[in-house]
Every structure is written in C-alpha cells, then in structure tokens.
C-alpha cells in the first residue's frame, strides 16, 4: 500500500524558517503534489504550494521555495514573519496524486520537544482517500 511521509524541521540559523519535507513510498508515477497547512487539502487546510513533476511549481505566502528533491519527494521552505512562530504548532499536509490511480495524503508537525536545527522525525498521520 502506498504511503506518504511528512517531516517538519526548524532551521538552526533562523528560528523563523521552517522546512517541510514530504515523500511518497510506493509504485507508480506522481502527477501532482499539493501542500497545505492547518489541515488536509479540501478539508479546511490552506494551500501553500502545488508541484507538477514536469511543468513547474506554484506557491503562496508564506511559502518561500517549493522544489522536487527526488522523483517522489519534495521540500517546501517557509518564512515565518510573525514573532510568535505559529508554524511550531501547525499541521502540514502533503497529498501525492497519481492520476487516475489514486491520491494519498498524510500530515505532520514539528514535535514540541525538537531542538532548532535538528530534523524532526517523521510524524505521518495517514488519511485514507477513496479516489
């Protein structure tokens, strides 16, 4: 069964900078990836970025840079302009779509105990979708 993992990390040098890493574990090719925060895509979450494997990326503030790391994983850099660092308590969700086979989504957040600069362990929250 395909799975999606989500990893959130705070940058050591800039505490207002976060990076979300997402990956797809499974067969098949990915046709589109959407990243949202505050909840799953289409269910109360706010879109941060959409990535197409061949045709580019689209992103919205506070997303700073969305890019492919491998054919099945992406990263999204975020700039937190607020002093209260709301990202630290935010859920980030990634949805990997393989049209028309199906889509798989998972969510994760920065563990409250994680130290700046250390990679937070993956905290996937599988969301079953019957596409």
């Amino acid at each position: 069964t395909p799975e999606v993992w989500v990893q959130v990390q705070m940058e050591a040098t800039e505490l207002s900078s976060f990076t979300v890493h997402c990956g797809f574990l499974g067969p098949g090719s990915i046709s589109l990836v959407t990243v949202s925060w505050g909840g799953p895509d289409g269910a109360g979450g706010t879109k941060l970025a959409v990535l197409h494997p061949e045709l580019g990326t689209r992103q919205w503030a506070p997303a700073r840079q969305a890019r492919w790391e491998t054919q099945s994983s992406i990263s999204l850099a975020l700039e937190d302009s607020g002093a209260s660092s709301p990202f630290a308590n935010t859920t980030f969700c990634c949805k990997f779509a393989s049209f028309p086979e199906g889509s798989w989504e998972s969510c994760g957040s920065l563990p409250p105990s994680s130290d700046p600069g250390l990679s937070a362990p993956p905290t996937p929250v599988p969301i079953l979708r019957a596409d």
Partner: nanobody, 121 residues
Amino acid sequence: EVQLVESGGGLVQPGGSLRLSCAASGYSYSGDCMGWFRQAPGKGLDEGVATIDNAGRIKYADSVKGRFTISRDNAKNSLYLQMNSLRAEDTAVYYCAAGWTFGGQCSPADWGQGTQVTVSS
C-alpha cells in the same frame, strides 16, 4: 471529504450523442481549473479532452473540437460534457477532475471514479 461523481456514460451508436455530468459534493475547491479526461482501453491517459479555468477559458483536444462542449453550473456545483457525433475512438473511461493549470493545461488534483463511454454499432 472531496467527492466528484460522474454520470451519463453508456453505450451509444456511432454518430450518436451523450451528455456527461459531474456533481461535486463536500468539496472545498481551491484549484483553478476543471475538466474532462479520458483513458481508452489499453492506452495511456489523454491530455484534457475539455477543460475550463476559473476565468472561463475553455480548451479542447484537437480530436474533439467541434463535437464536444464543456459547460459548468456554479450554482449546482456541476460540470458537464455534451458529446455529439461520437466515434468508435471516443470509447474510453471519462473522468471529471479539478486541479491546477500548469503550462496552459489543467493538471488533476482531485477526480471521480470515472464513467464508461462505449461507441459501437
């Protein structure tokens, strides 16, 4: 929960017509395009057969121009595809999808289960 449900498929003779419908429910639409895509038996997925973006711009595949018409009813949260002068090569599973525009084409983010269209005498 996102749900896009297609209907209206079936068996039709060459030269006949069909109207496909797609009803969206529980859908928080945040993309910028919707459209119809198809996959013929034993073949790969076609680029959008007919797509429409949020500005109302419509795009058709060359193979269906002049025969297919896409439309939408925002009040009913529905998308339609009127298919006329159907040919055997139009036989496929048709998917209703919502997504994002990249490079001038609509890339699906959400889609339905598909409806079978068979053109045969």
